[in-house]
Interface confidence: low
């Protein structure tokens, strides 16, 4: 891939990180452990297609098919959650889908999170018989160890009886767990004798303990959770971002490149100009300027918009996207009409973009 | 230059733990795995898992998963590898490695390697 | 897990031969095989991956190549340094797994 001559220096990195950034989400594929998935890689044209997951080259094997475009996993288990990705390899250039599967019911710790069924694990007893606690619906406490996807919601689960009604207190690795000890606290829901933890992170780790008593009795069962952080990777772009488009010269545009990124991203917005009535350097290559980075004093660097613009602006538009383990690019072109054309549909133009890598 | 420094031999009676550490330097720690590999005596290569410096996450190989610890100190740019329930085939030299990610995983840096014997 | 069996186990060669190992996978690894050469009292050191591509500072006598199952070492001219034992590695899935290694000795 081409390297490119500069005519502003884009090797400095910002002195602080981005202020702000957005963070767009892969397609979301969600099975139950034991379910068959296909999924269906959303490229065109691909001469050849590689599978990854969780940046791990991914092969047949005896619960994996891949037939052409298909990925087929058989069986899903926990195991097989994570963040996959498709490439499809022509002739000239390659191109990346990714999307994230989720093979989990840990949401619930067996049912699912609107508690439908919740009243009936609430049991009543009879005021006359004195009962110590018990458990009422074993089945939804038998699944212990949950390993779900970091950002997930968790529920856990402990329904029971007894007389008069128990309470119930949860533990966290055998210790008091206290609203400050996660960000964003968390929710017990009694009637319901459930424990909820929203958008869980790695230090969520560990041994979740509810103790349900009465005067007569304390009975207790530990879940164990482990929060899976997906591997990192190079930038994602939103395919189809940023998208053609034309203006009268006066006019306004806005190009958009959605980014999403486990890694802090630094995006920049790159246009090819000309210097000295040349588009191309003493070495070939073409000179590029950087108009808009991701850094303090920019804001959503996600979105380049030119105001007024003139002839001069036309041209392709770059959006380069980096974190620390590698970049990615796309772009588009901006078609400027005189002003007596007023624009119809956009200009359709197929280009293959200057890879920055 | 880029190196990868073991610590000392160590013995060990069965049931015990031994903690593995690998200082790195010549790079930025937390842009590179760390991957742990052991060889029994006049044996080949076997993998154990990884770590990755950055944001702690593990990766292991089934066979160690219930035994082995990774973990890192950032701020000294070392990796420990942790081995518990020692039983006398646990005897082997444990190496470390720095694994380039994510253009594919290979080990383009080894540590020394450090022996751990187990014996009652 | 992808077993990975190297042959031959041992080989002996004379400086200027040219000497091939060959690696096979219990699966299709898709290419994706490292190759490391390890020397009494040195650290390991990664000479090919990705089947095919010399690692910085590898000599150019060293070359792999190879699809699907079977890969192959090939060291075009044999130098003193060269005698070591050598281990074929898949990263095609997880756990990633060494062949039981190929001692070269001299002749």
């Known amino acids: 891939r081409p390297s490119f001559s500069l005519v502003e220096d884009t090797t400095l990195e910002p002195e602080e990180p981005p202020t702000k950034y957005q963070i767009s989400q892969p397609e979301v594929y969600v099975a139950a452990p034991g379910e068959s998935l296909e999924v269906r890689c959303l490229l065109k044209d691909a001469a050849v297609i590689s599978w990854t997951k969780d940046g791990v080259h991914l092969g047949p094997n005896n619960r994996t098919v891949l037939i052409g475009e298909y990925l087929q996993i058989k069986g899903a288990t926990p195991r097989d959650s994570g963040l996959y990705a498709c490439t499809a390899s022509r002739t000239v250039d390659s191109e990346t889908w990714y999307f994230m599967v989720n093979v989990t019911d840990a949401i619930s710790s067996g049912d699912d999170e609107d508690d439908t069924d919740g009243a009936e694990d609430f049991v009543s007893e009879n005021s006359n018989n004195k009962r110590a606690p018990y458990w009422t619906n074993t089945e939804k406490m038998e699944k212990r160890l949950h390993a779900v996807p970091a950002a997930n919601t968790v529920k856990f689960r402990c329904p029971a009886g007894g007389n008069p009604m128990p309470t119930m207190r949860w533990l966290k690795n055998g210790k008091e767990f206290k609203q400050e000890h996660r960000i964003g606290g968390y929710k017990v829901r009694n009637q319901h004798w459930s424990l909820i933890m929203e958008s869980v992170v790695p230090s969520d780790k560990g041994n979740y303990t509810c103790v349900v008593e009465n005067e007569y009795g304390s009975i207790n069962h530990t879940y164990h959770l482990d929060v899976v952080e997906r591997s990192p990777h190079r930038p994602i772009l939103q395919a189809g971002l940023p998208a053609n488009a034309s203006t009268v010269v006066g006019g306004d545009v806005e190009f958009v490149c959605k980014v999403y990124s486990d890694a802090q991203p630094h995006i920049q917005w790159i246009k090819h100009v000309e210097k000295n009535g040349s588009k191309y350097g003493p070495d070939g290559l073409p000179y590029l300027k950087v108009l808009k980075h991701s850094g303090i004093n920019s804001s959503n660097a996600e979105v380049l918009a030119l105001f007024n613009v003139t002839e001069a602006d036309a041209g392709e538009y770059i959006c380069k996207v980096s974190n620390y383990i590698g970049q990615a690019n796309q772009s588009a072109w901006l078609t400027v009409l005189p002003k007596q054309q007023a624009p119809g549909r956009e200009k359709e133009i197929t280009a293959s973009p200057d890879y920055l890598e | 230059q880029v190196q990868l420094v073991q610590s000392g031999a160590e013995v060990k009676k069965p049931g015990a733990s031994v903690k593995v550490s690998c200082k790195a330097s010549?790079?930025?720690?937390?842009?590179?795995?760390i991957h742990w590999v052991r060889q029994a005596p006049g044996q080949g290569l076997e993998w154990m898992g990884y770590i990755n410096p950055r944001n702690v996450y593990t990766n292991y190989n089934e066979k160690f998963k219930n035994r082995v610890t990774l973990t890192v100190d950032t701020s000294i740019s070392t990796a420990y590898m942790e081995l518990s329930r020692l039983r006398s085939d646990d005897t082997a030299v444990y190496y470390c490695?720095?694994?380039?990610?994510?253009?594919?995983?290979?080990?383009?840096?080894w540590g020394q390697g450090t022996l751990v014997t187990v014996s009652s | 897990d992808i077993q990975m069996t190297q042959s031959p186990s041992s080989l002996s060669a004379s400086v200027g031969d040219r000497v091939t190992i060959t690696c096979s996978a219990s699966q299709d690894i898709n290419n994706y095989l490292n190759w490391y050469q390890q020397k009494p009292g040195k650290t390991i050191k990664l000479l090919i991956y990705?089947?095919?591509t010399l690692q910085s500072g590898v000599p150019s006598r060293f070359s792999g190549s190879g699809s699907g199952t079977d890969y192959t070492l090939t060291i075009s001219s044999l130098q003193p340094e060269d005698f070591a034992t050598y281990y074929c590695q898949q990263f095609s899935d997880l756990p990633f797994t060494f062949g039981q290694g190929t001692k070269l000795e001299i002749k």
């Open positions: 490695a720095r694994g380039d990610w994510p253009e594919g995983y290979y080990f383009d840096f």
């Open positions: 990705y089947t095919s």
């Open positions: 010549g790079y930025t720690f937390t842009r590179y795995w």
